[in-house]
Interface confidence: medium
């Protein structure tokens, strides 16, 4: 052997954001030729050792991190990256709203405002775009979240959650979407890869291969991915809390 | 061939700042994560935290409120500030690649003394 | 935060002989265990990671086994070059090293 087993790639399809009772997929992708996979939630005692764990109604025992490894012969690979598996809907939607407004010359400056009724310290914001269901997006622990210089990348729809630092992996609804109009420009607005589309129960028979349902904290299967910053703190953008230890 | 190289200023006024420079090759900064660890002068090794390859980070939880990991992917360095040092920060800080820290820096001696 | 008990925090042994070194963990840390080899004057050394999984290049005279919160490191057949301190490393939950076992030869 010359090197260590790289470690597996572990997916959320169609999102690792997932609203209350709706379907996701967790895939865990090593070489070919792999001998066994283990998928565990992270902080508790639950594992199974395959490859896929079908999600048929997503819960909020079941939001968390999550991570997985595979064994070839007597070796284990390095371990995949977490992935944060967020159910959405928990909590009623925040508002979202632009200051000044929603149409903003280019060049300008907007701020977004995220806010809630509730006593919520956590808030994520998210730019709809092209599909990129693998790919966190990009996240902004703060109420408000000002674009300095605003350009045509930045048009687009917007969405904002919030939540609890006490338990991150529940979320709220998303607020209603905010249409960024920036204005003085031709220049076809970039796409960037953001938020994935809406998970929707679209499943074929190929990847509902195992149905999970969980005895004594164990995956058992039928065949069939800290900075959590407070409103208060930096004004820099800060990813998503790879945070995997329960808060 | 995985490399990576701190630097760092040597010396550090207490109550200052310091910054370290982990610079790597051989590996993509967006595919695997960077690790931060301290070894004071005659102590044991202490895990200081971790940026993922999306950006995301980790932090030693009795650290965190004095620590920003941040890093530029084009330039593959990543970065290190702490702020609010005193004579105990004294050490070598070495920064390791992903999990389980396969790959190690020969580390960067900072001093913190007036 | 999970913490790491390591003993011995030294050790001394003969050329040839064989030494084992324990890390008991908080709680249980599902095997997520590294063992590291660090000499003066060098960045540590992965020797191994999910408790027996030998890094390439690692002579199988390194050894390690647990499971739960208990967890050992061996090495037999001691030679001249095993001199160093060794720590382990939970990476189950954030990541936090043992105290350190410093190895001497006789």
């Known amino acids: 052997q010359s090197g260590p087993l790289p470690k597996p790639s572990l997916q959320a399809l169609p999102s690792s954001l997932v609203p209350l009772e709706k379907p996701v997929t967790l895939r865990c992708q090593g070489p070919p030729g792999v001998d066994l996979y283990r998928l565990e939630k992270l902080s508790s005692s639950r594992y199974q050792d395959q490859a896929v764990l079908f999600i048929p109604a997503m819960k909020r025992s079941l939001a968390g991190r999550y991570r997985c490894s595979y064994q070839n012969g007597s070796l284990w690979s390095l371990p995949s990256d977490q992935l944060e598996l967020v159910a959405t809907g928990v909590f009623a939607k925040p508002s979202l709203s632009a200051q000044p407004g929603p149409a903003v010359s280019s060049g300008g400056d907007v701020t977004l405002q995220c806010q809630t009724r509730y006593g919520f310290d956590q808030f994520a914001l998210y730019k709809e775009g092209d599909p990129a269901p693998y790919k966190n997006p990009e996240r902004w622990y703060r109420a408000s979240f000002p674009i300095i210089t605003v350009t045509a990348a930045h048009s687009g729809t917007y969405r904002c959650y919030s939540f609890s630092s006490r338990d991150p992996y529940l979320w709220s609804a998303p607020s209603d979407p905010l249409e960024l109009v920036v204005t003085g420009t031709s220049v076809t607005p970039s796409r960037l890869p953001t938020e994935p589309p809406s998970p929707v129960a679209e499943f074929s028979e190929a990847t509902a291969e195992l149905t999970v349902s969980f005895t004594n904290e164990v995956f058992t299967t039928e065949t069939s991915r800290s900075i959590t910053a407070s409103p208060k703190e930096s004004d820099s953008p800060a990813g998503p809390a790879r945070q995997y230890y329960t808060k | 061939q995985v490399q990576l190289k701190e630097s760092g200023p040597g010396l550090v006024a207490p109550s200052q700042s310091l910054s370290i420079t982990c610079t790597v090759s051989g590996f993509s900064l967006t595919g695997y994560g960077v690790n931060w660890v301290r070894q004071p002068p005659g102590k044991g090794l202490e895990w200081l935290g971790m940026?993922?390859?999306?950006?995301?980070?980790d932090y030693n939880s009795t650290l965190k409120s004095r620590l920003s990991i941040s890093k530029d992917n084009s330039k593959s360095q990543v970065f290190l500030k702490m702020n609010s040092l005193q004579t105990d920060d004294t050490a070598r800080y070495y920064c390791?690649?992903?999990?389980?820290?396969?790959?190690w820096g020969q580390g960067t001696s900072v001093t913190v003394s007036s | 935060d999970i913490q790491m008990t390591q003993s011995p925090s030294s050790l001394s042994a003969s050329l040839g002989g064989k030494v084992t070194i324990t890390c008991k963990a908080s709680?249980?840390?599902?095997?997520?265990i590294a063992w590291y080899q660090h000499k003066p004057g060098k960045g540590p050394s992965l020797l191994i990671h999910y408790t027996s999984t030998l890094q390439p290049g690692i002579p199988s005279r390194f050894s390690g086994s647990g499971s739960g919160r208990d967890y050992s490191f061996s090495i037999s057949n001691l030679e001249p070059e095993d001199i160093a301190t060794y720590y382990c490393l939970q990476y189950a939950n954030l990541l936090t090293f043992g105290g350190g076992t410093k190895l001497e030869i006789k």
């Open positions: 709680q249980d840390i599902n095997k997520y």
């Open positions: 940026i993922w390859g999306d950006g995301s980070t």
């Open positions: 390791a690649r992903d999990l389980p820290m396969d790959y």
